[in-house]
Interface confidence: medium
């Protein structure tokens, strides 16, 4: 069996004038193509992988949102040589998730990598941005995580921070076929540089306190001890799932119309960005691996 | 029936500038990647510089790079490219390519640029 | 130079088969990057011959057929006729250049 090859982390990998093509190990009957797209509120990215696969032919689609990152997952096996170039891959420079102009900042910063390589978001080197409240969600959070795709024994993975709706979340994750999104999250201005080493204690949790010991005195102590009991109840899980999106258009010869950098689109919007202009639309380079594609 | 029309060529003198459009019909452009490939009289094929549908992406042969910038406007269906300093070794027929799948599939005509004094 | 070699010059008679070849390197046709092949008829654009190293564009007859072994590539084009006469370009992604780099063309002449 012969596939076609790549790996794609948020740059143009996978691009059409980049394509390879490899011959697949005896007993090896599969080709296989994924590609998992992260969005923030400030723009999107994907990683993508092509190559000889394992087990059986089929799709599989899903979306997933961690505290208000949304994550979209493309699984396509095939057991025809090269026929791994359906999906469309995003391999371009994302351009940011919406208008953010439109909406006010709410007060909170947050370091932002979205397709930065683990290089460039490094402690406090990352971009800054300014979170804002969208579709009735309020993103006061900042994140500091990663995604990772599995496929074609190739493993990819990238940084991932930003603005979330939750400022408390410690190594919380979404998975999908082959995809993992996890993090923590944390309250207050740029406070993302750096939470691998969170634990699970949050402002959510009362304090223990220790008190002083007893005076040897009699006279009734004023000192008192107040904990805070008003946090919201965090609920067990806010992995949501995401409408499926729709079909992609199969890989066809070249006569055809180049589409190679569409965006898939989501069938619907994630809850709490349907009213941002590119919800659910991830650039797709999908073509022979083009500047893009390696291919000319 | 997919188009490429190539426009802005002439003649310019050493250190000049240029610049090249290419009108696209026929296809969605904005779903396209697009490429600029030159050949100079008498010589083969040199790829010059590509972008990315959304144009957010752009990428250039050495020869050219921080003197030639890519661009484009979907709304309008044209492609860019924009020739500063040019030599005398720019001289050459320069190609607007659609990328389709894998490959060049399509071609426009090709306007001459001569950089002579 | 060009990054991927070619023969300056092939000919033929009409009727026969002709074979043009494309020589590489580890950074591009032998890492794997497919290869394509342009056409080029006198006085006009290229036009895409054969991509994704042996795959025909609607409308390519299938007289030209593709290769590639290694980091070689070759074009083959049977039944040769008077209107194949033309500069064939071969084509791959260059790792180091990062780039689509082509052959230097093979002028073919129909004899």
């Known amino acids: 069996l012969e596939c076609y090859s790549c790996v794609q982390k948020a740059d143009d990998g996978c691009s059409p004038n980049k394509m390879k093509t490899v011959k697949c190990a005896p007993g090896v009957d599969v080709c296989t193509e994924a590609v998992g797209a992260v969005e923030t509120i400030h723009g999107q990215f994907s990683l993508a992988v092509r190559g000889c696969g394992s087990g059986l032919p089929g799709k599989n689609d899903r979306g997933l949102d961690l505290h208000g990152l949304l994550a979209f997952i493309q699984l396509q096996q095939c057991a025809q040589d090269r026929c791994n170039a359906k999906l469309n891959l995003t391999s371009r420079a994302l351009d940011p998730a919406g208008n953010e102009s439109a909406y006010p900042p709410n007060g909170v910063e947050c370091y932002s990598c979205v397709g930065l390589s683990r290089e460039a978001c490094q402690g406090t080197s990352p971009p800054v941005v300014s979170c804002y409240n969208a579709s009735d969600h309020v993103y006061k959070g900042c994140f500091d995580g990663n995604v990772t795709l599995t496929a074609a024994n190739v493993t990819v993975s990238l940084p991932v921070r930003g603005c979330v709706q939750d400022e408390f979340c410690t190594r919380d994750g979404v998975t999908g076929p082959g995809f993992t999104l996890s993090g923590s999250c944390c309250q207050g201005s740029r406070c993302n540089s750096d939470l691998r080493n969170k634990t699970y204690f949050s402002p959510r949790i009362p304090p223990l306190v220790r008190l002083p010991p007893p005076e040897p005195t009699t006279v009734a102590s004023t000192t008192s001890v107040t904990t805070s009991t008003s946090a919201p109840v965090r609920p067990t899980s806010t992995t949501k799932p995401m409408p499926a999106p729709t079909s992609q258009t199969p890989r066809q010869g070249v006569e055809h119309e180049a589409s190679r950098d569409e965006e898939p689109r989501l069938t619907g919007g994630a809850a709490g960005h349907q009213d941002r202009s590119n919800s659910g639309q991830y650039p797709a380079k999908g073509g022979p691996q083009q500047p893009h594609n390696k291919g000319c | 029936e997919v188009q490429l029309l190539e426009s802005g060529g002439g003649l310019v003198q050493p250190g000049g500038s240029l610049r090249l459009s290419c009108a696209a019909s026929?296809?969605?452009?904005?779903?396209?990647?697009m490429s600029w490939v030159r050949q100079a009289p008498g010589k083969g094929l040199e790829w010059v510089s590509y972008?990315?549908?959304?144009?957010?992406?752009?990428y250039y042969a050495d020869s050219v790079k921080g003197r030639f910038t890519i661009s484009r406007d979907n709304s309008k269906n044209t492609l860019y490219l924009q020739m500063n300093s040019l030599r005398a070794e720019d001289t050459a027929v320069y190609y607007c390519?659609?990328?389709?799948?894998?490959?060049?599939?399509?071609w426009g005509q090709g306007t001459l640029v001569t950089v002579s004094s | 130079e060009s990054v991927l070699t070619q023969p300056p010059s092939a000919s033929g008679t009409p009727g026969q088969r002709v074979t043009i070849s494309c020589s590489g390197s580890s950074s591009n046709i032998g890492a794997g990057y497919v290869v394509h092949w342009y056409q080029q008829l006198p006085g006009t654009a290229p036009k895409l011959l054969i991509y994704d190293n042996n795959q025909r564009p609607s409308g390519v007859p299938d007289r030209f057929s593709g290769s590639k072994s290694g980091t070689s590539a070759s074009l083959a084009i049977s039944g040769l006729r008077s209107e194949d006469e033309a500069d064939y370009y071969c084509?791959?992604?260059?790792?180091?250049?990062?780039?689509?780099?082509f052959g230097g063309g093979t002028k073919l002449t129909v004899l």
């Open positions: 972008i990315s549908s959304s144009g957010s992406s752009t």
């Open positions: 026929g296809f969605t452009f904005s779903s396209a990647w």
């Open positions: 084509a791959a992604w260059d790792d180091r250049l990062n780039g689509p780099v």
């Open positions: 390519a659609r990328e389709g799948l894998w490959a060049f599939d399509y």
